[in-house]
């Protein structure tokens, strides 16, 4: 089979998930992604990005945070915050635009 | 393997809001290999990409219906949705909810029709 | 927003034939992401090349696909009966993800 598309040099990040594989992944970039779901804990997830890039440039919300950056383990000792809860008419929006 | 299918409404009225349903079955949402995505076929037309969701529940739309479209996901029924507001004719369509990643839209569901008349 | 334009709007050509469909991009495709379609009526679409040249999962080694940059190759060498269909490309590297307009393939 033809070989995977050129998607530039790789970054080896830390993995930190459910869907971990291993310690660490490789990807274009590296992630880390805050998510607190309705009546939950947050939950920081770490790995690598390959693909829609404009995620990382989103506004943090009270519900998720996405963070990226391009260097070796890079998203190892990154912790990130939730914004607080805001009234309705305040609330950014987790739109990627 | 994982599969998708389509649940909503065949008829909204104009003005009214249009909702669908995306239940993936045979693999998890909250995978971060893979982005949910909303596409619509106009009868007769090609292939329209409304928007996108991450199990964060990031989004990504289409900016000619951003001001329209809402996509949200729930993880724990394994479920992504959508919501088109003040529909009009020419939002009939056939909507299709498909999993994208690195390798492209590899799953598709099999696509609802939606009609919008009073 | 990258505008992707298929050439030609329809193709007619006999079984056994060699097919050649054409998507060009007004911009370049970002990291190689292009793919491509087959939709025949009443049916989904069916992912056949992801990355401008990796076939998907059970697709037949008849279609193939290749280009770079803004312009790109469906290639299907030996045209099947089951074959004739609807063709779209899609760039998926940056949002918005855009489709092109599609290739008929009818048989001539």
């Known amino acids: 089979d033809p070989v995977k598309p050129s998607r530039g040099p790789l970054v080896t990040c830390t993995c930190e998930s459910p869907h971990c594989k291993g310690p660490t992944c490789r990807g274009a970039w590296c992630t880390v992604v805050l998510v607190r779901e309705e009546g939950r804990h947050p939950q920081e997830h770490r790995g690598c990005g390959n693909l829609h890039r404009e995620l990382c440039r989103g506004r943090p919300t009270e519900f998720v945070n996405h963070y990226c950056c391009d260097s070796h383990l890079c998203n190892h000792n990154v912790s990130l915050v939730l914004e607080a809860t805001q009234p309705p008419s305040e609330q950014p929006g987790t739109d990627g635009q | 393997q994982v599969q998708l299918q389509e649940s909503g409404p065949g008829l909204v009225k104009p003005s009214q809001t249009l909702s669908l349903t995306c239940t993936v079955s045979?693999?998890?949402?909250?995978?971060?290999?893979?982005?949910w995505n909303w596409i619509r076929q106009h009868p007769g037309k090609g292939l329209e990409w409304i928007g996108y969701i991450y199990y964060s529940g990031s989004t990504y739309y289409n900016p000619s219906l951003k001001s329209r479209v809402t996509i949200s996901v729930d993880t724990s029924k394994n479920q992504f949705s959508l919501k088109l507001s003040s529909v009009t004719a020419a939002d009939t369509a056939v909507y299709y909810c498909?999993?994208?990643?690195?390798?492209?839209?590899?799953?598709w569901g099999q696509g609802t029709t939606v009609t919008v008349s009073s | 927003e990258s505008v992707l334009t298929q050439s030609p709007g329809t193709l007619s050509l006999s079984p056994g034939e060699r097919a050649t469909l054409s998507c060009r991009a007004s911009q370049s495709v970002s990291s190689s992401y292009l793919a491509w379609y087959q939709q025949k009526p009443g049916q989904a679409p069916r992912l056949l090349i992801y990355?401008?040249?990796s076939r998907a999962t059970g697709i037949p080694d008849r279609f193939s696909g290749s280009g770079s940059g803004t312009d790109f190759t469906l290639t299907i060498s030996r045209l099947e009966p089951e074959d004739f269909a609807v063709y779209y490309c899609q760039q998926y590297g940056s949002s918005p993800i855009t489709f092109g307009q599609g290739t008929r393939l009818e048989i001539k």
């Open positions: 498909a999993r994208e990643s690195t390798d492209g839209m590899d799953v």
């Open positions: 045979g693999g998890s949402i909250s995978s971060g290999d893979y982005y």
């Open positions: 990355g401008v040249s």
